[in-house]
């Protein structure tokens, strides 16, 4: 069904990182435009990106209303310059997206090491708690606010002078690790949601090394054997 001069969208794909969520599709329009609708399984359809020639639509504002809901989108095709025209069945052509549950599926963005502080033979490494576009009481929530203890971080660290790596996990945004006195270390972190089956891990953060700007070293620490 449908008019001879419109084609249905295809390859509808959700692209979502830290809840910033865009629906993409094909083909690039030739003499046609698109409108997107989104709804929860039990909700009403809401139209977005009206009569656009783009092949993407930012649906973040809709999905952040409840990130644990499952959403479905559909893309309608209309002839350019004649958006009232419909297919022979009395409806414009459209294609459904796969279902999308933001809480379970949004990709974890690359984390950032906010700081590290050495106090004697301990280093405190802090991961930046990235702000998301999810709101509660008119304030934007951080990744930790949204995921709580479902989100963990894995730290990789190694002496600058050797290749042997160690690892640690935390269910907060801080690591407290033991290091050898007088050695410089490098750090990289990864966000993980262990309860997921897909999109479980982020890419690694940029590597940060001691002796660079982000770190701090405090001398006001005495080892037991210095006492």
């Amino acid at each position: 069904s449908g008019t001879t001069n419109t084609v249905a969208a295809y390859n509808l794909t959700w692209k979502s990182t830290n809840f910033k969520t865009i629906l993409e599709w094909e083909p690039k329009p030739v003499n046609q435009v698109y409108t997107v609708q989104i709804s929860t399984k039990s909700g009403d359809w809401k139209s977005k990106c009206f009569y656009t020639t783009d092949t993407e639509c930012d649906l973040t504002d809709e999905i952040v209303k409840d990130v644990k809901q499952t959403y479905l989108a559909r893309v309608f095709s209309y002839p350019a310059g004649n958006v009232e025209s419909t297919g022979s069945a009395g409806e414009p052509l459209y294609e459904n997206s796969p279902e999308f549950t933001p809480y379970l599926e949004t990709n974890l963005g690359q984390p950032t090491i906010q700081s590290f502080e050495q106090v004697g033979t301990k280093v405190n490494v802090t991961v930046e708690d990235e702000r998301t576009l999810v709101r509660r009481n008119n304030t934007f929530l951080s990744l930790r606010d949204v995921f709580g203890k479902d989100l963990i971080y894995t730290l990789y660290y190694w002496k600058s002078s050797s290749s042997g790596k160690k690892t640690a996990k935390t269910n907060t945004n801080e690591f407290l690790i033991d290091v050898d006195k007088g050695e410089n270390y490098c750090f990289s972190v990864q966000a993980v949601i262990p309860s997921r089956t897909v999109n479980r891990k982020s890419t690694d953060s940029p590597v940060e090394c001691m002796g660079q700007e982000k770190g701090e070293f405090r001398e006001d620490y005495k080892d037991d054997d210095d006492k």
Partner: antibody
Framework: QVQLLESGAVLARPGTSVKISCKAS????????MHWVKQRPGQGLEWIGG????????MYDPKFQGRVTITADTSTSTVFMELSSLRSEDTAVYYC??????????WGQGTLVTVSS | DIQMTQSPSSLSASVGDRVTITCKAS??????LSWYQQKPGKAPKLLIY???SLADGVPSRFSGSGSGTDYTLTISSLQPEDFATYYC?????????FGGGTKVEIK
């Protein structure tokens, strides 16, 4: 379903090396961490080391550092452990295990390595 | 390195008994602790993850508790198939370390 299939039993001479494999199915190894665990006859479990197939990072217990290499081939979903300079104390069953972040939730059936002259 | 002290190393119990096994870490492991059951000639089987969560397919008579440095595995009513060796594992920091094991035998 998730499965970890390890290579077969090995008999090796002292001083030589052995490389054993663990083929994963039912999941993408890049989404998890993979580990090797040693168990000598009648003894407890001992962590050897692990690997993050997503970035190639490997971590080892200092007891094995320098003698062990853990790698992953994401194209074949296979994890390898190579142990060199074998001695009689290396006679053991070696298990590969998947780490979800919360636990080692799936284990291979074990590979018996016997070191004997 | 984090040491895991598991106790007791063995115990004798009867079917229907309540059994408690403990693991103490030498420092805070932030609940990155799991419990395993192993039977002779078999690979370990996950019972409890993240200190308190029951793994899929594991009977509800098994439970885990604890935080910080002190963790407990409880079998509320021991069944014939529960006679085995149990291990805790801390995986909060490398090198990962197992407890020494607890062999649960028939009284």
């Amino acid at each position: 379903q998730v499965q970890l299939l390890e290579s077969g039993a090995v008999l090796a001479r002292p001083g030589t090396s052995v490389k054993i494999s663990c083929k994963a199915s039912g999941f993408n190894i890049k989404d998890y961490y993979m580990h090797w665990v040693k168990q000598r006859p009648g003894q407890g479990l001992e962590w050897i080391g692990g690997n993050d197939p997503a970035n190639g990072h490997s971590m080892y217990d200092p007891k094995f550092q320098g003698r062990v290499t853990i790698t992953a081939d994401t194209s074949t979903s296979t994890v390898f452990m190579e142990l060199s300079s074998l001695r009689s104390e290396d006679t053991a069953v070696y298990y590969c295990a998947r780490d979800s972040g919360y636990a080692m939730d799936y284990w291979g059936q074990g590979t018996l390595v016997t070191v004997s002259s | 390195d984090i040491q895991m002290t598991q106790s007791p190393s063995s115990l004798s119990a009867s079917v229907g008994d309540r059994v408690t096994i403990t693991c103490k870490a030498s420092q805070d492991i932030k609940s990155f602790l799991s419990w395993y059951q192993q039977k002779p000639g078999k690979a370990p089987k996950l019972l409890i993850y993240y200190a308190t969560s029951l793994a899929d397919g594991v009977p509800s008579r098994f439970s885990g508790s604890g935080s910080g440095t002190d963790y407990t595995l409880t079998i509320s009513s021991l069944q014939p198939e529960d006679f085995a060796t149990y291990y805790c594992l801390q995986h909060g920091e490398s090198p990962y370390t197992f407890g020494g094991g607890t062999k649960v035998e028939i009284k």
